[in-house]
Interface confidence: medium
């Protein structure tokens, strides 16, 4: 029977800068029941606080709700593991909410083949930002990537769309069925997961771009 091994805070993520969650990996339990607590303080303060919510994020997590989350303050946190033989502490983790935003995937992905009479046909892709993100405040800039491939192909073709929420693609293989997905990323944060795939059948008379 031993004191617990050193835990590690391995991930902190926020869906929208308004709340965030951190997760830790326990160390070895030393063969005894082990309790974990996450404590934190804000930059410039010495007063320590305990995690406000150990439930919402699932096992080995701490969730910071709206009233505990501030974009303008940085958090310094650690996890303490304790059993009957002693304690061990994780390394501290510095968290700036601006940097840990991982949005939900974009919504309402729509794909359409457009065949204007006077121009080359193209694939028109349109989507909406995730609902939790409020772009009107100006706090957020979302960047988008699109990926697509013929259904049976191994490699994805990736396009960067910048901040726009629609995109045109000209060079496609006629007669193929394509999968299309989109994802988004805030300026300082992480890429979202890819949206669910939308399928589009490219007509056989679709003319390849020169």
């Amino acid at each position: 029977q031993l004191p617990p091994g050193k835990p590690e805070i391995f991930k902190c993520r926020s869906p929208n800068k308004e709340t965030f969650t951190c997760w830790w990996r326990p160390g070895t339990d030393g063969g005894l029941p082990t309790n974990y607590s996450l404590t934190y303080h804000r930059e410039g303060e010495t007063l320590m606080h305990e995690c406000p919510d150990y439930i919402t994020g699932g096992p080995n997590s701490c969730h910071f709700g709206k009233q505990y989350t501030s974009m303008w303050r940085t958090y310094i946190m650690m996890v303490n593991a304790t059993n009957q033989m002693g304690s061990s502490f994780s390394d501290e983790l510095y968290v700036d909410v601006t940097y840990i935003v991982q949005p939900d995937p974009p919504l309402e992905l729509a794909v359409e083949v457009k065949q204007p009479e006077d121009r080359k046909p193209y694939l028109w892709i349109k989507w909406s930002p995730p609902t939790l993100i409020d772009l009107k405040t100006g706090w957020f800039t979302l960047l988008y990537e699109i990926r697509l491939k013929p259904e049976k192909a191994a490699e994805w073709e990736i396009h960067f769309a910048g901040q726009q929420t629609e995109f045109k693609i000209l060079s496609l293989h006629p007669g193929q069925k394509y999968l299309v997905q989109v994802r988004c990323k805030p300026d300082h944060g992480y890429w979202s997961a890819w949206s669910p795939a939308t399928f589009i059948q490219i007509p056989s008379d679709f003319t390849m771009n020169d």
Epitope: K11, C12, I76, F89, E92, L93, Y94, D96, Y99, Y190
Partner: antibody
Framework: EVQLLESGGGLVQPGGTLRLSCAAS????????MSWVRQAPGKGLEWVSS????????YYADSVKGRFTISRDNSKNTLFLLMNSLRAEDTAAYYC?????????????WGQGTLVTVSS | DIVMTQSPDSLTVSLGARTTINCQSS????????????LAWYQQKPGLPPKLLIY???TRESGVPDRFSGSGSGTDFTLTISSLQAEDVAIYYC?????????FGQGTKLEIN
């Protein structure tokens, strides 16, 4: 105003011992990690050792491991570096440095340094 | 150990000119847990201790003039002085604090012509 004042440097023979001290003021000493960084004459900076808020968490450069011991006395706002088995290559200005946080995340304040000369 | 390599070793620049110093780490110092690069930049003037300019690769320390900026991610970083002033003559060091041993670059000596 943050102040770090090193003392204890001087001339010592190879194999000798010195104990450096760093008196801290102007901030809550017990809330921050502290480090020693050295600079040989005309050379660059070399990290030597660090100690976190919890005094059990100490870290050393391979070049000094087993010979140097870092410690702190939070009640006296003082950082120490006990240097045993000194070698000529330990000759340097030794700076006491305050970390930005309670772990070792960049050094936001440095003392003026104390010179250690190891020579016969 | 993470090796930090700065370039150039020295440079001579005109007053008012834009100046860049590069720093490369031998392995990534970007932490996926918090999306931060564990990199600092220091300025050392003759006879004085180093002074922290930038931490987290791009956050300017309070009191540092806004002509100093840091950028980069992963393994490649840059310190930029947008308009060189006479008082910027110094040696500049990058440092990683991702893993012990914390390591510094060899330094870049900045002079004015």
């Amino acid at each position: 105003e943050v102040q770090l004042l090193e003392s204890g440097g001087g001339l010592v023979q190879p194999g000798g011992t010195l104990r450096l001290s760093c008196a801290a003021s102007g901030f809550t000493f017990s809330a921050y990690a502290m480090s020693w960084v050295r600079q040989a004459p005309g050379k660059g900076l070399e990290w030597v050792s660090s100690i976190n808020v919890r005094a059990g968490d100490t870290y050393y450069a391979d070049s000094v491991k087993g010979r140097f011991t870092i410690s702190r006395d939070n009640s006296k706002n003082t950082l120490f570096l006990l240097m045993n088995s000194l070698r000529a290559e330990d000759t340097a200005a030794y700076y006491c440095a305050k970390a930005r946080y309670s772990s070792n995340w960049g050094f936001d304040f440095w003392g003026q340094g104390t010179l250690v000369t190891v020579s016969s | 150990d993470i090796v930090m390599t700065q370039s150039p070793d020295s440079l001579t620049v005109s007053l008012g000119a834009r100046t860049t110093i590069n720093c490369q780490s031998s392995q990534t110092i970007l932490h996926s847990s918090n999306n931060h690069n564990y990199l600092a930049w220091y300025q050392q003037k003759p006879g004085l201790p180093p002074k922290l300019l930038i931490y987290w690769s791009s956050t300017r320390e309070s009191g540092v003039p806004d002509r100093f900026s840091g950028s980069g991610s992963g393994t490649d970083f840059t310190l930029t002085i947008s308009s060189l002033q006479a008082e910027d003559v110094a040696i500049y060091y990058c440092q990683q604090y991702s893993n012990t041993p914390y390591t510094f670059g060899q330094g870049t000596k900045l002079e004015i012509n």
